[in-house]
C-alpha cells in the first residue's frame, strides 16, 4: 500500500516547488465526475460561483472545466529518491478568469476570480491513484485531497495509506 | 540514479505459470508505478499491465484472467506472474517505471535491460 | 480498449530525410500519448511524452504533434543512428495500448 509517508516526503516543499516554465505543457476541456458518476456543476448564484455534487438529468450538459497541467521540479532530498523526479500539477478553471482554490482554513474548495500568475492555493498534484481516475492534492497542504463531502467539494486529509483510494477523493474526466 | 532490473526463469514450460521480478534502485514504489511490457518474436510491443504508487494495479484486458502484478515496497521489488503460459507467451519481458510521480500520463523513460522468457516443454 | 493504429508499418528513407510517423487513436486521448524507439535487442527509449514534450536527452531532430484522436512523430534530418522501430503508447485510459509500431530502414 502507499504509505503516506511516502507522499509527504515526496511532496513536503511542494510550496517550494518549481513549475517548469510559466506556460501549462498541455491544456485542455473535460468535464469532472466522482467516482459514483455524480457531475461536477458550477453555478453562478449572487455574483458568486457554487460548485455542486449532482445526479444530472438525462441529456442534461455536463459542465466542462479547463484543466492546465503544469510540469514540477523536485530534487531528490525532498523525493526520498536517489535523482530529481517530475509532479505533473493542474489548475482548473470552469469559466474565464475562475479557478478553483483550496481554502485550507475551512477545508473547503472555492471559486476565485484571480489573475496570472495564479497563488499556489490554485494548483493541484495530479495523481492516478485507481485505475482510470484521478485525484488533486493540495500543492500547499501535503496530505490534503479535494474530495466529496454532503454533495459539496470539500479537502479531505488523507492519514493513513487505506484512505488514498478511498472513493470519495476520486475522481473521473471525460472530453464527452 | 534510476535502474531497474528483471529477472526470473528463462525457460517455463506449458500450463505452468511465468514469474518474474523487476528489482529497482534509485527510487522509491510508494512514489511512482511501475508497468511490465513485452516484446514477442517478431511482433510488436505489448504492455501487459501497470501497479500505481498507491498499490492498485490494471492489467491488459486480454490477459487479466491469467496475470498478477504485485510489489513489496520495502524490497523494492514488483513481481509478475502469468499463469497457463503457451508458447504465445515466449517474449522479452520489460519492466518500466513511470516518468511522473504518482501519475502515469507522461509515459516510462526508464527500462529495465529485459529478460527472454521461452515458453516451451 | 482504445486502439492504437500506426502508419506506415515500414518505410525506407535515406540519412537527411524528413521522416514522419502517424498515429491515430480510435477515440480522443487529449495529449497523452507516447512516443518511443526501439533498437533489436535493446530496450525501448522514450522520445516523447504529453504529445509534443521533447524526452530527457533526445535530440532535437525529434517532434512531436497533435491531440485528440491525431498524433504525429516527425524526425526532421533523419541520422544515421535513427534506423529503428518506432511505437506510439496512449496513457489515457488503462489498459495503456501501443501501436503496432513503424520501422525506418535504411533505403
Known amino acids: 500500500a502507499f504509505g503516506i509517508s511516502g507522499v509527504q516526503k515526496y511532496t513536503r516543499a511542494l510550496h517550494d516547488s518549481s513549475i517548469t516554465g510559466i506556460s501549462p505543457i498541455t491544456e485542455y476541456l473535460a468535464s469532472l465526475s466522482t467516482y459514483n458518476d455524480q457531475s461536477i456543476t458550477f453555478a453562478l448564484e449572487d455574483e458568486s460561483y457554487e460548485i455542486y455534487v449532482e445526479d444530472l438529468k438525462k441529456d442534461e450538459k455536463k459542465d466542462k472545466v479547463l484543466l492546465s497541467y503544469y510540469e514540477s521540479q523536485h530534487p531528490s532530498n525532498e523525493s526520498g529518491d536517489g535523482v530529481d523526479g517530475k509532479m505533473l500539477m493542474v489548475t482548473l478553471s470552469p469559466t474565464k478568469d475562475f479557478w478553483l482554490h483550496a481554502n485550507n482554513k475551512e477545508h473547503s474548495v472555492e471559486l476565485h476570480k484571480c489573475e496570472k500568475p495564479l497563488p499556489d492555493q490554485a494548483f493541484f498534484v495530479l495523481h492516478n491513484m485507481h485505475s482510470n481516475c484521478v485525484s488533486f492534492e493540495c500543492k500547499t497542504d501535503p496530505g490534503v485531497f479535494i474530495g466529496v463531502k454532503d454533495n459539496h467539494l470539500a479537502l479531505i486529509k488523507v492519514d493513513s495509506s487505506e484512505n488514498l483510494c478511498t472513493e470519495n477523493i476520486l475522481f473521473k474526466l471525460s472530453e464527452t | 540514479q534510476v535502474q531497474l532490473q528483471e529477472s526470473g526463469p528463462g525457460l517455463v514450460k506449458p500450463s505452468e505459470t511465468l514469474s518474474l521480478t523487476c528489482t529497482v534502485s534509485g527510487f522509491s514504489l510508494t512514489n511512482y508505478g511501475v508497468h511490465w511490457v513485452r516484446l514477442p518474436p517478431g511482433k510488436g510491443l505489448e504492455w501487459l499491465g501497470v501497479i500505481r504508487a498507491g498499490g492498485s494495479s490494471d492489467y491488459n484486458s486480454a490477459l487479466m484472467s491469467r496475470l498478477t502484478i504485485s510489489k513489496d515496497n520495502s524490497k523494492s521489488q514488483v513481481s509478475l506472474k502469468l499463469s497457463s503460459v503457451t508458447a504465445a507467451d515466449t517474449a522479452v519481458y520489460y519492466c518500466?517505471?513511470?516518468?511522473?510521480?504518482?501519475?502515469?500520463?507522461?509515459?516510462?523513460?526508464?527500462w529495465g535491460q529485459g529478460t527472454l522468457v521461452t515458453v516451451s516443454s | 480498449d482504445i486502439q492504437m493504429t500506426q502508419s506506415p508499418s515500414s518505410l525506407s528513407a535515406s540519412v537527411g530525410d524528413r521522416v514522419t510517423i502517424t498515429c491515430l487513436a480510435s477515440q480522443t486521448i487529449a495529449t497523452w500519448l507516447a512516443w518511443y524507439q526501439q533498437k533489436p535487442g535493446k530496450s525501448p527509449k522514450l522520445l516523447i511524452y504529453a504529445a509534443t514534450r521533447l524526452a530527457d536527452g533526445v535530440p532535437s531532430r525529434f517532434s512531436g504533434s497533435g491531440s485528440g484522436t491525431d498524433f504525429t512523430l516527425t524526425i526532421s534530418s533523419l541520422q544515421p543512428e535513427d534506423f529503428a522501430t518506432y511505437y506510439c503508447q496512449q496513457l489515457y485510459n488503462t489498459p495503456y495500448t501501443f501501436g503496432q509500431g513503424t520501422k525506418v530502414e535504411i533505403k
Open positions: 518500466a517505471r513511470d516518468h511522473y510521480f504518482s501519475n502515469s500520463y507522461g509515459g516510462s523513460p526508464y
